[in-house]
Interface confidence: medium
């Protein structure tokens, strides 16, 4: 599923991401935009043999199990395919674990490069939340 901007903002808010670990909803929507272009079925392969999955591009070396990433830790204890569902529950729950890990949203390269320090509230402007 490819979410609309405000549709995703509303779904993320319902799942408790607004101000989770101090990150406003705009940060999460911005991250999703530049990680996956709001596409729940996005997959991207990395040079280390791991793959990033879903709307928040969660990595198989650390967070989920895709059955083929050497040394996978599967810290979210889920199959990576669950992160590709049109229901973003699994991605949100895993993202909460990632953002609580110590580096905050710096774990997402796209957030660090495209969202951090910008007017992230613009990503939820005009949305009925």
């Amino acid at each position: 599923k490819v979410f609309g901007r405000c549709e995703l903002a509303a779904a993320m808010k319902r799942h408790g991401l607004d101000n989770y670990r101090g990150y406003s909803l705009g940060n999460w929507v911005c991250a999703a935009k530049f990680e996956s272009n709001f596409n729940t079925q996005a997959t991207n392969r990395n040079t280390d043999g791991s793959t990033d999955y879903g709307i928040l591009q969660i990595n198989s070396r650390w967070w989920c199990n895709d059955g083929r990433t050497p040394g996978s830790r599967n810290l979210c204890n889920i199959p990576c395919s669950a992160l590709l569902s049109s229901d973003i529950t699994a991605s949100v729950n895993c993202a909460k674990k990632i953002v609580s890990d110590g580096n905050g949203m710096n774990a997402w390269v796209a957030w660090r490069n495209r969202c951090k320090g910008t007017d992230v509230q613009a990503w939820i402007r005009g949305c009925r939340l």
Epitope: T43, D66, G67, R68, P70, L84
Partner: antibody
Framework: QVQLQESGAEVMKPGASVKISCKAT????????IEWVKQRPGHGLEWIGE????????YYNEKFKGKATFTADTSSNTAYMQLSSLTSEDSAVYYC?????????WGQGTTLTVSS | DIELTQSPATLSVTPGDSVSLSCRAS??????LHWYQQKSHESPRLLIK???QSSSGIPSRFSGSGSGTDFTLSINSVETEDFGMYFC?????????FGGGTKLEIK
Amino acid sequence: QVQLQESGAEVMKPGASVKISCKATGYTFSTYWIEWVKQRPGHGLEWIGEILPGSGSTYYNEKFKGKATFTADTSSNTAYMQLSSLTSEDSAVYYCARGDGNYYYWGQGTTLTVSS
Amino acid sequence: DIELTQSPATLSVTPGDSVSLSCRASQSISNNLHWYQQKSHESPRLLIKYVSQSSSGIPSRFSGSGSGTDFTLSINSVETEDFGMYFCQQSNSWPRTFGGGTKLEIK
């Protein structure tokens, strides 16, 4: 136990298309990548590409882009590979395998013969 | 693409001999190297994964070693059922690639 069952041998004319199937049993089909591999005598094994059935995400070896198309039906636990514009170079045995980085589980292979 | 070169192309041995098969990668692939056996008209069978880890049900006479770019499959005291083709495969990057194979034949 995990099994991959491929469709039977095919004889096709040049220019035609063929669709090979790979039915998976014994595991959660949507969760694992299915890989496709080509084997021609004297050419060894060639990786064609892969599909993740749960999402339909696909990756292709550049060499096979435009030649192979992968699909999957999660209701029947079956992956498909369509080969188009067939030539004699496409005559080969085609395998599906479960994509665990290494391939422990393989189908029995589908022999494709392209001949006028 | 990563190229895998296997040598020798053919190895003629007598049952009971011990042999080593080589696989060389065109660039470092860490430990992401796997070995397969294939007999005529059969699907490949995984022998060794990640350089040295034995696959389920594989006899202990098969072992693997190496790192980086140079890898070896060793068979200690070859048995008649071991004759066939052997392929290496890398999973360090895409596209996945296989070596050209080594044919193990009876002398």
